[in-house]
């Protein structure tokens, strides 16, 4: 069929998602080409029952969510709107510090170990978490 | 079982084109992502392109982007792979090559086909 | 572009002998790492993935290990059909990168 009516294997759903959790850690970049691979997007954020869930999967580690201010303005990678959409910043963030000497400012949002937000390095190795919708993707395959 | 059967190979002269397709079966296609590997006449392996199982999402070397183009038919279980502009550096056995997932073994090339032979030169 | 690295380039070894071949990544890959076998004329065949994971139908005297930017792939008691060319490919990052090979012949 051309919907699926079920989360792939190792995936999580929840509210008509389906979310995956990675155990290591990559570039805000790297992480995204790995869930477009999957036909999926880094998670998006809109609402506080969703962020309550992802931080209850994460735990407390930097991991990587799908919202960047890399051409200027925050945008989150499925177009959804930044301006009128659910934040959770960290007090005085994002504040796309400079002086971590790696050159650059922070472009890249990720949970913190308290699940607030954080703009930092898009180059740092957090880890990261993948979503896609369930009426989106073709149906899953059983294991091969 | 699965298998993996590329065509469309040959001789071409510089700055032609050609496109092979590879012909899947034994596996749900649509569910995975898919990919193009080259292996130059007695040289190693080097990855050409990716795209994801629905085909909305493509991934290509440095070498070949601009150049070449990787699509697919999910209705007819194809994988394709345009080369344009082709050069003689291009010369190479073209493997079709399905990924593994993700979230179960990590996105390795875990199914090859047999390779066809494109020949660049005048 | 991460490079792979691998040595070395080739090895003459009898049928019996333990055989191990290393592979490095210009850059930590965590265990983003796969291990291919190819033969002459044919396909490559996925033997490790993730540094150390087993491809279904895999003979158990292959075994990989490593983790950041160093890696192995060890043959325990090569076998006449293990005479092949040995790569390692990184998974971490797009573009994926292959090792330049290991030619294991017979001595």
């Known amino acids: 069929g051309s919907e699926r009516t079920c989360c792939p294997v190792n995936w999580v759903e929840h509210e008509r998602s389906c979310y995956w959790f990675s155990r290591s850690g990559k570039a805000w970049a790297d992480a995204d080409n790995y869930c477009r691979l999957e036909d999926a997007h880094l998670v998006v954020v809109t609402s506080w029952e969703e962020q309550k869930f992802v931080q209850h999967h994460i735990g407390p580690v930097n991991t990587w969510m799908g919202l960047h201010d890399q051409n200027g303005p925050w945008k989150w990678v499925d177009g959804t709107d930044y301006e009128t959409g659910f934040k959770n910043w960290r007090p005085e963030q994002p504040d796309d510090w400079y002086g971590h000497g790696l050159g650059g400012g922070e472009d890249c949002a990720h949970f913190t170990d308290d699940g607030r937000w954080n703009d930092d390095v898009c180059q740092r190795p957090y880890r990261w978490v993948c979503e896609t919708e369930l009426d989106k993707a073709s149906q899953e395959p059983p294991l091969l | 079982e699965v298998q993996l059967l590329e065509s469309g190979g040959g001789l071409v002269q510089p700055g032609g084109s050609l496109r092979l397709s590879c012909a899947a079966s034994?596996?749900?296609?649509?569910?995975?992502?898919m990919s193009w590997v080259r292996q130059a006449p007695g040289k190693g392996l080097e990855w050409v392109s990716a795209?994801?199982?629905?085909?909305?999402?493509?991934f290509y070397a440095d070498s070949v982007k601009g150049r070449f183009t990787i699509s697919r038919d999910n209705s007819k279980n194809t994988l394709y792979l345009q080369m344009n502009s082709l050069r003689a550096e291009d010369t190479a056995v073209y493997y079709c090559?399905?990924?593994?997932?993700?979230?179960?073994?990590?996105?390795?090339?875990?199914?090859w086909g047999q390779g066809t032979l494109v020949t660049v030169s005048s | 572009d991460i490079q792979m690295t691998q040595s070395p380039s080739s090895v003459s070894a009898s049928v019996g002998d333990r055989v191990t071949i290393t592979c490095r990544a210009s850059?930590?890959?965590?265990?983003?790492l796969a291990w291919y076998q190819q033969k002459p004329g044919k396909a490559p065949k996925l033997l490790i993935y993730?540094?150390?994971s087993f491809q279904s139908g895999v003979p158990s005297r292959f075994s990989g290990s490593g983790s950041g930017t160093d890696f192995t792939l060890t043959i325990t008691s090569l076998q006449p059909e293990d005479f092949a060319t040995y790569y390692c490919?990184?998974?971490?990052?797009?573009?994926?990168?292959f090792g330049p090979g290991t030619k294991v012949d017979i001595k």
């Open positions: 795209i994801s199982g629905s085909g909305g999402n493509t």
């Open positions: 490919q990184q998974a971490s990052s797009f573009p994926f990168t």
């Open positions: 993730a540094a150390s």
């Open positions: 090559a399905k990924l593994g997932r993700i979230a179960v073994t990590g996105p390795y090339f875990d199914y």
């Open positions: 850059q930590a890959i965590n265990d983003w």
């Open positions: 034994g596996f749900t296609f649509s569910s995975y992502a």
